[in-house]
């Protein structure tokens, strides 16, 4: 049985792969910061880490997906204060008891050094320095990407 | 109804020590950040410490790093400020204060417990 | 550290008065500024979060203004609960800074 929350990251997900293909993204639109392949919106107002989940969908985007050690140290580049913590778009799973990403992977234990506890409505935040396990319920900004598409020419069948 | 309340002030020797406690009721504790006030007598408001909700992430004043540590309990809802190397300069009443990420206000605060460090 | 910077440190008023208080930073903080009261023995009170914001409970009587480093807090008609020391503090970055504070004391 899935908590509420992994239901919503489950829907939010499904909703996003049944819309249509949009065309590529070539530039970060405004107020978004382009972080190599990606464009990422820092929000300014707090939020439970469902509600950030939510938004970022509203936006025709994901909470931030992170790769690898290096994009993290490159996103938290980009945080300007050690007090400010950001969800991301990982979570606890309680029927799986493994951290999971709301694109269905689970967390490389190698990629993330989380400090706090794996449990029941536990969510991931990052600041400057660290990556920490919050209570979901706590009312922190949020990260939301864009993937940029580099666009490639077709290449049509003569006719 | 949030509620507040700071205990464990009380007249301390310079380079003594003491630990402060706030116990939290009304909401749910550990989804906030909670931070320490301090006021001089006849003085302004000097922020000195913050922590997460879940304890994992802290914050000082330069003027407290190395000698306070802030804490909490959860599970008992409290929050907990142990000082030590006391000086002079910081005797004052010390204030429990929901909030402490950026960019969050204190909106609750507790009624206040007075520190004297003198000999 | 960012300085906050009260204007006037202290003022005599009249209960139904318009009072004004500024804030200054010594650098731009967006909206992120608060302004609290406080009472003689008293732990201080939220007035105005986010610059602007009212909290809930709080007189719609009092106002705040500005963005960047400049700011206003605002009592349209005092009253005699008003007379209080008033604060403002910048939560934009760490160490969260106050003001030395302003004293409306009666006139």
């Known amino acids: 049985q899935k908590s509420s929350i992994e239901k919503c990251s489950v829907d939010i997900q499904q909703s996003r792969n049944k819309t249509t293909e949009r065309p590529g993204l070539l530039n970060c639109p405004i107020y978004w910061q382009q972080l190599r392949e990606k464009c990422l919106l820092f929000s300014h107002t707090v939020n439970p880490w469902n509600n950030s989940l939510a938004d970022c969908s509203t936006k025709e985007s994901s909470l931030l997906l992170i790769r690898d050690k290096d994009e993290l140290i490159h996103t938290q580049n980009l945080i300007r204060d050690k007090a400010i913590l950001f969800w991301i778009g990982l979570n606890f799973s309680l029927s799986e008891k493994n951290w999971k990403w709301i694109n269905g992977s689970f967390l490389n234990s190698n990629d993330l050094e989380i400090r706090g506890d794996a449990k029941e409505n536990s969510c991931i935040s990052i600041s400057q320095t660290s990556v920490y396990s919050e209570y979901c319920s706590t009312e922190i900004r949020w990260i939301c990407q864009k993937e940029l598409t580099p666009v490639r020419n077709k290449v049509y069948p003569d006719s | 109804e949030v509620q507040l309340v700071e205990s464990g002030g009380g007249l301390v020797q310079p380079g003594g020590s003491l630990r402060l406690s706030c116990a939290a009721s009304?909401?749910?504790?550990?989804?906030?950040?909670m931070s320490w006030v301090r006021q001089a007598p006849g003085k302004g408001l000097e922020w000195v410490s913050a922590i997460s909700g879940s304890g994992g992430s802290t914050y000082y004043a330069d003027s407290v790093k190395g000698r306070f540590t802030i804490s909490r309990d959860n599970s008992k809802n409290t929050l907990y400020l142990q000082m030590s190397s006391l000086r002079a300069e910081d005797t004052a009443v010390y204030y429990c204060?929901?909030?402490?990420?950026?960019?969050?206000?204190?909106?609750?605060w507790g009624q206040g417990t007075l520190v004297t460090v003198s000999s | 550290d960012i300085q906050m910077t009260q204007s006037p440190s202290s003022l005599s008023a009249s209960v139904g008065d318009r009072v004004t208080i500024s804030c200054r930073a010594s650098?731009?903080?967006?909206?992120?500024l608060n302004w609290y009261q406080q009472k003689p023995g008293k732990a201080p009170k939220l007035l105005i979060y986010a610059a602007s914001s009212l909290q809930s409970g709080v007189p719609s009587r009092f106002s705040g203004s500005g963005s960047g480093t400049d700011f206003t807090l605002t009592i349209s008609s005092l009253q005699p609960e008003d007379f209080a020391t008033y604060y403002c503090?910048?939560?934009?970055?760490?160490?969260?800074?106050f003001g030395q504070g302003t004293k409306v004391e009666i006139k």
């Open positions: 009304g909401f749910t504790f550990s989804s906030y950040a």
């Open positions: 650098q731009s903080i967006s909206s992120y």
């Open positions: 204060a929901r909030g402490g990420y950026l960019p969050d206000a204190f909106d609750y």
């Open positions: 503090q910048q939560t934009y970055s760490t160490p969260l800074t």
